[in-house]
């Protein structure tokens, strides 16, 4: 069928394949120091690592992409590691009238796959 | 705000940035010759090209990723070009009793962004 099962064991060795990783960033790093009050230091989770053939394929398209990349590497890129879902986070904002809380649904990755 | 507007003009020159491209493939390329019928090559659209800073950012996470990649290129990968939406397509399947149609919602990309 079109849906071969995505492979879940990394053939490249531990920590080399697409996974979620925590990255530290300051408000200055993000250019947010003028309008975000807290947290001062953010722990952000991001998707990093390689996408070897059929590893954590997002869907049928990603499986096709992996296969065609093997045949036409100059024309078709390998799948790459991107968020499959996000975790909502709350930031404290400066506003004209003081401070407010705002939830961001697409700021921190919760899971990763190869697309 | 967290959402800087994603950039839509490619700073790398025509056709270099993330875009949708048509790719030709045979049933043999895809490993489908045993179970899919097709009198001619298949046309597939895929997302190809680079994702320079803030080009077609998928969301806030992608903007952060672009920024942190500039600061920590060894630790944080650049955003990459992946489908933002898909076009449903129909495949003609061989079955024990003949041929049948099946719709795939995630086989052909319709649009691309940098995630």
């Amino acid at each position: 069928s079109a849906h071969a099962h995505p492979r879940d064991s990394c053939p490249l060795g531990p920590g080399r394949c697409c996974h979620l990783e925590t990255v530290q960033a300051t408000l200055e790093d993000l250019g947010w120091s003028d309008w975000v009050l807290s947290p001062r230091q953010l722990q952000l989770s991001m998707c990093v690592g390689e996408c070897p053939h059929l590893y954590r394929s997002a869907n049928t398209h990603a499986q096709i992409k992996a296969r065609l990349h093997g045949l036409q590497p100059d024309k078709v890129p390998a799948p790459c590691c991107v968020p499959s879902s996000y975790t909502p986070v709350v930031l404290m904002h400066r506003t004209d009238s003081g401070v407010s809380l705002q939830t961001y649904d697409d700021l921190v990755a919760r899971g990763c796959h190869c697309a | 705000s967290a959402h800087a507007h994603p950039r839509d003009s490619c700073p790398l020159g025509p056709g270099r940035c993330c875009h949708l491209e048509t790719v030709q493939a045979t049933l043999e390329d895809l490993g489908w010759s045993d179970w899919v019928l097709s009198p001619r090559q298949l046309q597939l659209s895929m997302c190809v090209g680079e994702c320079p800073h803030l080009y077609r950012s998928a969301n806030t996470h992608a903007q952060i990723k672009a920024r942190l990649h500039g600061l920590q290129p060894d630790k944080v990968p650049a955003p990459c070009c992946v489908p933002s939406s898909y076009t449903p397509v129909v495949l003609m399947h061989r079955t024990d009793s003949g041929v049948s149609l099946q719709t795939y919602d995630d086989l052909v990309a319709r649009g691309c962004h940098c995630a």
Partner: antibody
């Protein structure tokens, strides 16, 4: 609610060309295959060719190869069919029809049709 | 090129079952669709892939396909079913092919 609205009736001289338009609304234009099918007075349906906007490619029935050009403008969700070197036997109602993209076959399963455009070829 | 042959006309009494055939070489190994066209109107897809009906098409419409013949069956035929019916499939290079059409007359 998907709708395909075609341009109005045309009267043409033999040897000339005609261009018929088909504007789609209520669906994602690029996600489907658009065909042109004609029907001469009192006759059956005849597939001329079609285009898949997302791939930007057109396919034509062998009978019409070299005489028909099918194009699409995604910005206006409009497909066009131009038929050249018209002769009296091209007098027909021309329909645009939309269907899903059928991999390797491209066209068929026409689930939405335009209202038809009558093209009369007469000297 | 692949040819589909339909009878020019079929007559049926109201409430009876109408069968419209579509013949083609080994058509049983093809996907076949059926279209209904009433006078002065555009065609409407009524059956695809053996016996699937698009939404809005009554259950009395069904299809079958084996050997060299595909059949559109209308059970409990109504006056409103009077129309031309066309079968459709593909040739060996993937071009769309229509049958010549069958005029269904509902008697009475």
């Amino acid at each position: 609610q998907v709708q395909l609205v075609q341009s109005g009736a045309e009267v043409k001289k033999p040897g000339s060309s005609v261009k018929v338009s088909c504007k789609a609304s209520g669906g994602t234009f690029r996600s489907y295959a658009v065909s042109w099918v004609r029907q001469a007075p009192g006759q059956g349906l005849e597939w001329m060719g079609g285009i898949i906007p997302i791939f930007g490619t057109a396919n034509y029935a062998q009978k019409f190869q070299g005489r028909v050009t099918i194009t699409a403008d995604e910005s206006t969700s409009t497909a066009y069919m131009e038929l050249s070197s018209l002769r009296s036997e091209d007098t027909a109602v021309y329909y645009c029809a939309r269907g899903p993209i059928i991999m390797g076959y491209q066209f068929g399963l026409f689930d939405h049709w335009g209202q038809g455009t009558l093209v009369t070829v007469s000297s | 090129s692949y040819e589909l042959t339909q009878p020019p006309s079929v007559s049926v009494s109201p409430g009876q079952t109408a069968s419209i055939t579509c013949s083609g070489d080994n058509i049983g190994s093809h996907i076949v669709s059926w279209y209904q066209q009433k006078p002065g109107q555009s065609p409407v897809l009524v059956i695809y892939d053996k016996s699937n009906r698009p939404s809005g098409i009554p259950e009395r419409f069904s299809g079958s396909n084996s050997g060299n013949t595909a059949t559109l069956t209308i059970s409990g035929t109504q006056a409103m079913d009077e129309a031309d019916y066309y079968c459709q499939t593909w040739d060996s290079i993937g071009s769309v092919v229509f049958g010549g059409g069958t005029k269904l007359t509902v008697l009475g």
